[in-house]
């Protein structure tokens, strides 16, 4: 079929077009162009014989139209008016006609763009701007750009006028942008320049900085005001209400108590006639006095006097503060504030009630602090010590023992033998002692102050003979291989020889093992569950010697990983399952048992009869000892067989 | 579900013996230790000793050392506590308990008690 | 042998309260401490073990804490059918020693 393509369909003006012909049939005698959608021979363009290859133009002919042997039409240097159908009727040799229509439209080519406002300088919150794409153009479409971006969706953004006009209603400062439209048809497109929007908004609510309202006496007063604003404000200061300067600093050096009062920034837009303020009110204090503390008892007793500090001097409306060792107050039942807080009270004082205390009046920029105060506390004597440790001694040495007595003031001492009063001295002194000097030895220490006494007795045995020692030890149950164990000998004696035995053994060497104390104290360290023996000590001077009583060490180990026997995994159908698990451990563990995850009994022996392959999984043994917080566990996986089904199959228990 | 199950009251004269039993049920007999607590009129809880039903060992507290007796027969899944020289003072419930496991386990289903009443 | 001393020996409190009594060794136990509570005319049921376990079908009101020698049992808030003796036991070899117990009572 005979079929006419427009190339292109869409034509600029000025450009050309060929109307290309399709399917031209055979045996052709000539063929005709024709403006319109039919054979109109007021209208035609062009005809053409091929038998002469002559063309002859027709009353539509513009001399713009060139014909190929092929039918084509070339038409060039488009105009508006070409704009509508062309037709091609072609006659066949035979006579026979065939006709075809194809059509092209003609497009200006756009000019470039360009914005024209109804406003040039909107007010915030006030006015609407309109934006028109200029010129009108006839089927051209109109498109707008924001920040090189498409329109947002705004209901205060509409398009109008077949979108040639852009209106933002009800304009915001965040509409400052950049604005662009394009005009676009077929055959072009055109952008604008860009057109800046100025909004014109504020002053928003000044702010004065710095935030600070406090002030000492003295400092310099540096206020800054800043308001947002297009066009930027004016700043105007005002102090209690009085004009001051129109600066946005304000600055008064060396301010006084008098320069108390509302400091008053005020911003104006001389473009949108708005004016706002903000008020700070500032406070200038004077320095405050510094602080000192009294105290109602300068020299209280331990346990039974009460002190009352009191911060000076008494302020109104002033926060008071205290502080214990440069530390805020604990908190203490024996620790009260008055109601202000000027007054501390210490109820029932002790010795480690000294302080030093510090009292601070706090105003709103800083915290004076008193000097410290010590409380002289008045204690003791605790239970006098009597050194040296020895109460066996051998005939023919000194005896010389010291008393001491924690004490405030220090505290006097006094020396009984058997109830007889000796001396008021501290260390008590006799030569050359026999068996007669053995008995009850009394230091009695006395404070004056409190009027307080305490006394402490030691038994001194003089004698050839050395008692039957006996072993401390200041750790009975120490954990494997993280506690030390320290055994002492007693009693501490004179000019004597210390000696251990393990299992009845002299020591062994090892690193673990140390000797101390003149070989009175056997240490070990890092103990082990080997370490676990009889430890027996034993004492000897030049005339005798003795052994004490043996001491086991109960060593807290484990629990080792424990071990499931028997060793069997695979079982019959039918069987019994007893599985046993063990783990060394002191004391002994806790046990539990897991099959496939679950809990099931806290037993040593699981047992399971008449088991099937359901039994099948893992068998997980947990063991706990709480002694030593350790735990350890072992998995095993069983594997239970239809009867007869493998060889090698356990029978169970 | 366990259960122990107490023989009943008893009362006997002052240097007599008296036998309680107590018998298990609902789980393996011989993987749980059993102990023996008794309870004076009025009084707390005191321990008196236990017995492992699979090794029949047997652990009394000092205060009943000499006293005490305790069995198990595994056939039957029940154990006997046996006191004898009873006082007036031996008077209490006596309950058998389950040990929640082996070893270091607190006592986790108590039979129902049983009365022993020593009086001449 | 292990004391275990039991503080207080009563006490008396409303329904809603919490309720603390405390059980002290006269040596260190670890954890092996246990809780029972017995109701007038029943026997001692088992309610925590290894000091914190609470066992499966107590009441989550129930709660132990401690170790060494020092040992709490708490109920949260205090209900009428809690209404019992409370015996603490230490469970760290034998012999087995209990609490005198606590007597807890509704106001």
């Known amino acids: 079929k005979l079929t006419i393509e427009s190339t292109p369909f869409n034509v600029a003006e000025g450009k050309e077009v060929l109307l290309l012909v399709h399917n031209l049939p055979q045996h052709l005698f000539g063929y005709s162009w024709y403006k319109g959608e039919r054979v109109d021979g007021n209208r035609q363009i062009i005809g053409y014989v091929i038998g002469t290859q002559q063309a002859t133009p027709g009353p539509a002919y513009s001399g713009r139209e060139i014909i190929y042997p092929n039918a084509s039409l070339l038409i060039q240097n488009i105009i508006q008016n070409d704009t509508g159908f062309y037709t091609l009727h072609v006659i066949k040799s035979d006579l026979v006609n065939e006709e075809a229509t194809g059509q092209f439209r003609v497009y200006p080519e756009l000019p470039k763009p360009s914005i024209s406002s109804n406003n040039s300088k909107p007010v915030e919150d006030k006015d609407a701007v309109a934006f028109t794409c200029e010129p009108e153009t006839q089927d051209a479409t109109y498109l707008w750009w924001v920040n090189n971006q498409s329109l947002p969706v705004s209901p205060r953004l509409q398009l109008s006028n077949g979108n040639r006009t852009l209106t933002l209603f009800n304009v915001t400062r965040n509409d400052t942008a950049s604005y662009k439209c394009e005009t676009q048809n077929p055959v072009s497109a055109r952008r604008s320049d860009s057109v800046i929007l100025n909004v014109l908004y504020g002053p928003d609510a000044p702010t004065i900085s710095p935030l600070n309202t406090s002030y000492r006496s003295g400092e310099n007063l540096n206020l800054s005001c800043h308001a947002a604003s297009n066009p930027p404000a004016q700043y105007s200061w005002f102090v209690n209400g009085t004009f001051q300067q129109s600066t946005q600093e304000l600055f008064i050096p060396n301010i006084t108590v008098n320069n108390s009062g509302s400091y008053t920034c005020q911003a104006h837009n001389s473009d949108t006639g708005l004016n706002r303020t903000t008020v700070t009110t500032i406070t200038v204090y004077a320095e405050p006095p510094k602080p000192f503390i009294t105290s109602n008892n300068s020299n209280p007793v331990e346990d039974e006097d009460a002190v009352a500090l009191t911060c000076e001097p008494e302020i109104q409306n002033t926060t008071y503060l205290w502080w214990v060792n440069n530390q805020s107050l604990p908190v203490s039942p024996r620790l009260q504030l008055s109601n202000d807080n000027r007054t501390l009270t210490l109820l029932s004082v002790t010795r480690n009630d000294v302080g030093p205390y510090e009292c601070g009046i706090q105003n709103e920029l800083s915290v004076d602090h008193s000097d410290p105060v010590i409380l002289n506390v008045l204690y003791g004597p605790d239970d006098p010590t009597i050194s040296p440790s020895y109460t066996y001694y051998r005939p023919g040495v000194n005896l010389s023992l010291s008393c001491h007595a924690a004490s405030n003031p220090p505290a006097q001492y006094s020396w009984l033998i058997d109830g007889n009063i000796q001396q008021h001295t501290q260390e008590l002194f006799i030569s050359n002692i026999t068996e007669k000097n053995s008995g009850l030895y009394t230091c009695q220490a006395n404070n004056s102050a409190s009027g307080h006494s305490r006394t402490t007795v030691k038994t001194i045995t003089v004698s050839a003979e050395l008692p039957k020692p006996s072993i401390s030890s200041n750790n009975s149950k120490p954990v494997e291989d993280k506690d030390a164990v320290a055994f002492t000998c007693e009693p501490e004696a004179q000019n004597t020889t210390y000696l251990w035995w393990v299992n009845g053994q002299s020591l062994p060497v090892s690193p673990r093992l140390q000797l101390s104390n003149g070989n009175r104290t056997l240490t070990l360290f890092n103990v082990t569950r080997n370490d676990a023996r009889a430890y027996v000590c034993g004492i000897q001077n030049s005339v005798s010697a003795n052994r004490s009583d043996p001491v086991t060490l109960d060593v807290l180990y484990g629990p080792d990983t424990p071990i499931i026997s028997p060793p069997d995994s695979s079982y019959l159908s039918g069987a019994n399952l007893n599985l046993s698990c063990h783990s060394a451990s002191n004391p002994s563990p806790q046990y539990s048992w897991r099959i496939n995850g679950i809990p099931q009994q806290h037993t040593q022996v699981l047992f399971i009869a008449k088991i099937t392959p359901n039994n099948n999984g893992t068998y997980a043994c947990f063991v706990s000892n709480l002694a030593t917080g350790r735990n350890n566990s072992i998995v095993k996986s069983i594997t239970v067989s239809a009867s007869g089904t493998s060889p090698g199959l356990s029978a169970g228990a | 579900q366990v259960q122990l199950v107490q023989s009943g009251a008893e009362v006997k004269k002052p240097g007599a013996s008296v036998k309680v039993s107590c018998k298990a049920s609902?789980?393996?007999?011989?993987?749980?230790?059993l102990h023996w607590v008794r309870q004076a009129p009025g009084q707390g809880l005191e321990w008196i000793g236990y017995?492992?039903?699979?090794?029949?060992?047997?652990n009394y507290s000092q205060k009943f050392q000499g006293r005490v007796t305790m069995t198990r027969d595994t056939s039957t899944s029940t154990v006997y506590m046996e006191l004898s020289s009873l006082r007036s003072e031996d008077t209490a419930v006596y309950y058998c308990?389950?040990?929640?496991?082996?070893?270091?386990?607190?006592?986790?289903?108590w039979g129902q008690g049983t009365l022993v009443t020593v009086s001449s | 042998d292990i004391q275990m001393t039991q503080s207080p020996s009563s006490l008396s409190a409303s329904v809603g309260d919490r309720v603390t009594i405390t059980c002290r060794a006269s040596?260190?136990?670890?954890?092996?401490l246990a809780w029972y509570q017995q109701k007038p005319g029943k026997v001692p049921k088992l309610l925590i073990y290894?000091?914190?376990n609470l066992v499966e079908g107590v009441p989550s009101r129930f709660s132990g804490s401690g170790s060494g020698t020092d040992f709490t049992l708490t109920i949260s808030s205090l209900q009428p059918e809690d209404v019992a003796t409370y015996y603490c036991?230490?469970?760290?070899?034998?012999?087995?020693?209990f609490g005198q117990g606590t007597k807890v009572e509704i106001k």
């Open positions: 036991q230490h469970h760290y070899g034998t012999p087995y020693t």
């Open positions: 017995i492992n039903p699979n090794t029949g060992y047997t």
């Open positions: 609902g789980y393996i007999f011989t993987s749980y230790w």
């Open positions: 290894n000091a914190k």
């Open positions: 308990a389950r040990e929640y496991g082996n070893y270091n386990y607190p006592l986790d289903y």
């Open positions: 040596e260190n136990i670890y954890g092996y």
